[in-house]
């Protein structure tokens, strides 16, 4: 997704943030998680996106554009009102599905316009086209009926590009999944730390082969796997020591002896 | 191992169509991890990404705006591998031309295998 | 389009020194960059992608970091297989786009 600057940025008077958060850097936390989020910079004064790693990390982390525009821009939503009010409906609705490249699996909405309607589609996670709305209702709003709904325009971010789908109709696939071999998990209640820790080692989808750490809740030990670069879940540390720090403090020994530290 | 290899003309003449093709072992051209393209290298330009293919129930395109009203790139299921088409060539596009693999992982589209190169010279 | 800036254009070194190559965006990129090298007559190799995750069978003194807009290549010991010119590409969105190149020469 692309950090291209907004045109209703440009418009908007004070540059002192709305929350002294907002002027915080961005923080991705010491766990490996990949989440897409974004944050207010201070230097650009642009909400931009981050990867962040699942913990820790600060305030200045939105899951949406909308929301650290929001929430850290001075009048952005009275100015992205302004700016959609009486807009025709734009360009990028009318262009078809893309997925994008990516192999991240994201639930997303795009305006179909065989059947005048949002519907939902897996958005891979990078690329695509900008006919991809993080929530229905913000598909609705801007495709579906956008002289109606004065809201703040689409902000999913693309870059200006050529793409467009079906240049050949040939249907052959391969699927290049690996299928983990879960280790033995514990029950529920012997574990109070984060849920993914108790997730099975997961290679991933694709094809890479990086050292990896994954926590093993019936051992209480990180152990080491290959991770394919893409996909999995949440268990999957860089190093031994960044697994044990997220994931040992909420292993239950017994109840004597409490959580292990 | 995935490899490409990659043949076609090395001499093109101005206003004629560039053809080159890039066999692919290793992987599949329709797998869904990933997708194929083509960059260039000139001396004037350095690498210029030309575009990429890509397939995933069915087959998508990205092209570079500079090229995009000349280029073509093509899945060949059958023999496993994709094409360049390059329409209306002038000197401008005289480069070492390129194919690679574009791996997906999460978030990251990167080229981790690459074609040999193919100097192709648009002369009269 | 996003332009990639390279810098230093060359750089002299020697076998066992420290090499840090720097690449700017014109814009925020998160940490959709990728760093290739490319030796004469050769196609570029991956290096690093995602800004800082080293690619398979590349050896652990390449190292990359930063996010945003710069970004930094690092080689810890210089070997005289890493002589050669170094790339960035940001992937942040199409089209992709490349640095002008650093070339790593011996001094």
């Known amino acids: 997704l692309s950090e291209e600057a907004d045109d209703t940025d440009s418009e908007l008077g004070s540059m002192k943030p709305l929350h002294t958060f907002c002027a915080m850097k961005a923080d991705d936390g010491p766990c490996k998680a990949m989440i897409r989020s974004y944050f207010f910079n201070m230097y650009t004064h642009q909400c931009e996106e981050f990867i962040y790693g699942g913990c820790e990390g600060n305030e200045n982390r939105f899951d949406t554009l909308e929301e650290c525009k929001k929430t850290c821009i001075p009048g952005y939503e009275k100015t992205a009102v302004k700016a959609a009010s009486g807009a025709e409906r734009p360009d990028f609705c009318f262009l078809e599905e893309d997925p994008g490249l990516c192999r991240g699996y994201m639930k997303r909405y795009l305006y179909n316009n065989q059947t005048k309607q949002c519907e939902r589609f897996v958005y891979g996670g990078c690329l695509g086209n900008r006919n991809n709305f993080e929530t229905l209702d913000e598909c609705k709003k801007i495709c579906e009926n956008p002289v109606h709904s004065p809201s703040p325009v689409n902000e999913v971010q693309m870059s200006d590009y050529v793409t467009d789908g079906n240049t050949v109709t040939d249907r052959s696939t391969v699927n290049n999944i690996v299928v983990p071999q879960s280790p033995k998990v514990p029950r529920r209640r012997d574990y109070r730390g984060r849920p993914w820790c108790l997730q099975p080692a997961d290679s991933g989808l694709c094809k890479a082969s990086e050292r990896r750490f994954y926590y093993n809740s019936a051992t209480g030990k990180c152990h080491r796997f290959n991770y394919t670069g893409c996909g999995g879940n949440n268990n999957n540390f860089t190093t031994r020591r960044r697994c044990l720090r997220s994931c040992k403090t909420g292993l239950i020994k017994n109840k004597s002896k409490g959580v292990v530290k | 191992q995935v490899q490409l290899q990659q043949s076609g003309p090395g001499l093109v003449k101005p206003s004629q169509t560039l053809s080159l093709t890039c066999a692919i072992s290793g992987d599949s051209v329709s797998s869904n991890s990933g997708g194929w393209g083509w960059i260039r290298q000139s001396p004037g330009r350095g690498l210029e990404w030309l575009g990429l293919i890509y397939y995933r129930s069915k087959w998508y395109n990205a092209y570079a705006v500079s090229v995009k009203s000349r280029i073509t790139i093509n899945p060949d299921t059958s023999k496993n591998q994709f094409s360049l088409q390059l329409n209306s060539v002038t000197p401008e596009d005289t480069a070492v031309y390129y194919c690679?693999?574009?791996?997906?992982?999460?978030?990251?589209?990167?080229?981790?295998?690459w074609g040999q190169g193919t100097l192709v010279t648009v002369s009269s | 389009d996003i332009q990639m800036t390279q810098s230093p254009s060359s750089l002299s070194a020697s076998v066992g020194d420290r090499v840090t190559i720097t690449c700017r965006a014109s814009q925020g990129i998160s940490s959709y960059l990728h760093w290739y090298q490319q030796k004469p007559g050769k196609a570029p190799k991956l290096l690093i992608y995602g800004a800082s995750t080293l690619q398979s069978g590349v050896p652990s003194r390449f190292s990359g970091s930063g996010s945003g807009t710069d970004f930094t290549l690092t080689i810890s010991s210089l070997q005289p297989e890493d002589f050669a010119t170094y790339y960035c590409q940001q992937q942040n969105g199409y089209p992709f786009t490349f640095g002008q190149g650093t070339k790593v020469e011996i001094k």
């Open positions: 690679a693999r574009y791996l997906g992982s999460n978030f990251y589209v990167y080229s981790d295998v």
